[in-house]
Interface confidence: medium
C-alpha cells in the first residue's frame, strides 16, 4: 500500500525530507544520490560497505611449483594492499605481492614459489577493511607432477629411424595424463633436446642420423598450468649404417 | 602452549562500566583477531565485539555499539573491552578467543569472566 | 545480519548411535561455517571449520559437511563424553552469527 507523498515507513508516519530533492522510497525513506547519505541524505560520503570477497571457486588444483593465487574483493571503502591476506593451512599469513584496483574491486596477487603437496587443505582469503571483515575459505589440492618409472624401449631401428615403445605407465606422481612428449638428441653433439608430441604408446622417429648413439626419454605433462613434469629414465640406442642389412 | 585469560567480571549497578582485560600468550598477538563473545545464562553464545591489532580495527555487534569500546595493547598482549551504560540484558559470562587468521573462527577461547547487572 | 538456524534445539541419543545436526544460513555463505562443543560451564571448543574441516585434536567421530546455505554435522558413534551442546556459527561476514545450539542428551 502507499503512502502519502513525502511519509515512509511501516505506517507511513516517517516523513522524508530529502535534502536535494531525492526520491522518497515507502520503504527505506530517502534514496540518497551517489555521494551523499544519512536519513535525509545530509551527510556526503559513500555509506560503507563490508567487504565481499568474488570469482573464488571452493576447489582449486594446483600443479607443484610456482603457484599464483589471486584474491578479489568489493566493498566501500575498497579494501587496500595491506587489509588482503591469505592464509595456509598451517596459519602461516601471507601479503600480496602485487595489488591493483579498479573502481569496484580490489586484486590482490600472491605468490608462493614453491608449492607442494603438504600444502594440501583450507586455504583462507580474508579481508578486513573498516566497513567489517570477510572470509572465504577454500581448498586447495596440489599434485604431484608426473614421471616416467621407466626409460623408453627401442623396438626396431634402421639407418635413419628408430621404433619406440615410450613405456609411459607406469609413472611417478598424479594423473590424468593430458600429453605425452618423446625427447631426443644425439649423445654425442651439443644440440639441444628435440620434441614430438606422441599420442600412441608406439612411436617412429624418422630423420635420424645413420651410425649415431641417441638418447631418448618422456616427459608426462598433466593438466593445469605448470603441468610438465620432469623427464623420465634416459635410453641410449645406435643407428644402423647405411647399407647394411 | 596458547592461552587467553580473562579478568574484570563482576556485579555492576544498571548504567554502571566495567572494565575487562583478555591477557593473550603463546602466540603472535599482532597477527591475530581477537573477538569477545557472550552467554546470557542458559542462553546461546552471541558474538560481541572484534578488533585486529595489526591495524587497530574494531568491530562491533548492535546490541553494544556505542556503549562497548574494544581496544589491545600489543606491547602487553592484552585486549580490553570496556563497557558502559551497562543493562540488565548485558549479564553474560564473557569470553574472549582468538583466530590467527583475522577472520571470524575462533580456535582458542579463555574460560570466561562472569558479568552480572543488577540493582 | 545473517541468521543461522539449527536443528534440533535438542536431542535424545544413546551412546554408540549416529547423530546429525543441522544448521540453515539465511544467505549464502560459501563454505565459512564452524562448528564448536561446548560444556557446562566451560567455554565452546572448536571442532569443524570451512564446514567440512576437522580441527586439529578432534576425534575422527566428527564430521562436517555443506556449502552454500544447508550444513551438517555428524557425530558417527556417540561417545559418553560427547553429551554437550553444539553451536554453528558462520565466519563469512562481518557480524559473525552463532545458531542457537543443539543440546544432545543421554537417552
Known amino acids: 500500500e502507499a503512502c502519502h507523498p513525502g511519509f515512509y515507513g511501516p505506517d507511513c508516519k516517517l516523513r522524508c525530507s530529502c535534502n536535494n530533492g531525492e526520491m522518497c522510497d515507502r520503504f527505506q525513506g530517502c534514496l540518497c544520490s551517489p555521494g551523499w547519505q544519512g536519513l535525509q541524505c545530509e551527510r556526503e560520503g559513500i555509506q560503507r560497505m563490508t567487504p565481499k570477497i568474488v570469482d573464488l571457486p571452493d576447489h582449486i588444483e594446483v600443479n607443484s611449483g610456482k603457484f599464483n593465487p589471486i584474491c578479489k574483493a568489493s566493498g566501500w571503502p575498497l579494501p587496500t594492499n595491506e587489509e588482503m591476506t591469505l592464509v595456509k593451512p598451517d596459519g602461516t599469513v601471507l601479503h600480496p605481492k602485487d595489488f591493483n584496483h579498479t573502481d569496484h574491486f580490489s586484486v590482490a596477487i600472491f605468490t608462493i614459489h614453491r608449492i607442494l603437496p603438504p600444502d594440501s587443505g583450507v586455504w583462507v582469503c580474508s579481508v578486513n577493511t573498516v566497513a567489517g571483515m570477510v572470509e572465504k575459505p577454500f581448498n586447495i589440492s596440489v599434485k604431484v607432477l608426473p614421471k616416467p618409472l621407466n626409460a623408453p624401449n627401442v623396438i626396431d631401428t634402421g639407418h635413419n629411424f628408430a621404433v619406440i615403445n615410450i613405456s609411459s605407465e607406469p609413472y611417478f606422481g598424479d594423473g590424468p595424463i593430458k600429453s605425452k612428449k618423446l625427447l631426443y638428441k644425439p649423445v654425442n653433439h651439443y644440440e639441444a633436446w628435440q620434441h614430438i608430441q606422441v599420442t600412441n604408446e608406439i612411436v617412429t622417429l624418422n630423420y635420424l642420423e645413420p651410425r649415431t648413439e641417441y638418447e631418448l626419454c618422456v616427459q608426462l605433462v598433466r593438466r593445469g598450468e605448470g603441468g610438465e613434469g620432469h623427464p623420465g629414465p634416459v635410453r641410449r640406442f645406435t643407428t644402423a649404417s647405411i647399407g647394411l642389412p | 602452549e596458547v592461552q587467553l585469560v580473562e579478568s574484570g567480571g563482576g556485579l555492576v549497578q544498571p548504567g554502571g562500566s566495567l572494565r575487562l582485560s583478555c591477557a593473550a600468550s603463546?602466540?603472535?598477538?599482532?597477527?591475530?583477531?581477537i573477538h569477545w563473545v557472550r552467554q546470557a545464562p542458559g542462553k546461546g553464545l552471541e558474538w560481541v565485539a572484534s578488533?585486529?591489532?595489526?591495524?587497530?580495527?574494531?568491530y562491533y555487534a548492535d546490541s553494544v555499539k556505542g556503549r562497548f569500546t574494544i581496544s589491545a595493547d600489543t606491547s602487553k598482549n592484552t585486549a580490553y573491552l570496556q563497557m558502559n551504560s551497562l543493562r540488565a540484558e548485558d549479564t553474560a559470562v564473557y569470553y574472549c578467543a582468538r583466530r590467527q587468521s583475522y577472520s571470524y573462527v575462533m580456535d582458542y577461547w579463555g574460560q570466561g569472566t562472569l558479568v552480572t547487572v543488577s540493582s | 545480519d545473517i541468521q543461522m538456524t539449527q536443528s534440533p534445539s535438542s536431542l535424545s541419543a544413546s551412546v554408540g548411535d549416529r547423530v546429525t545436526i543441522t544448521c540453515r544460513a539465511s544467505?549464502?555463505?560459501?563454505?565459512?561455517v564452524a562448528w564448536y562443543q561446548q560444556k557446562p560451564g566451560k567455554a565452546p571448543k572448536l571442532l569443524i571449520y570451512?564446514?567440512?574441516f576437522l580441527y586439529s585434536g578432534v576425534p575422527s567421530r566428527f564430521s562436517g559437511s555443506g556449502s552454500g546455505t544447508d550444513f551438517t554435522l555428524t557425530i558417527s558413534s556417540l561417545q559418553p563424553e560427547d553429551f554437550a551442546t553444539y553451536y554453528c556459527?558462520?565466519?563469512?561476514?562481518?557480524?559473525?552469527?552463532f545458531g542457537q545450539g543443539t543440546k544432545v542428551e543421554i537417552k
Open positions: 570451512s564446514a567440512s
Open positions: 578488533i585486529t591489532p595489526y591495524n587497530g580495527y574494531t
Open positions: 556459527q558462520q565466519s563469512y561476514t562481518t557480524p559473525p552469527t
Open positions: 603463546g602466540f603472535t598477538f599482532s597477527n591475530s583477531a
Open positions: 544467505q549464502d555463505v560459501s563454505t565459512a
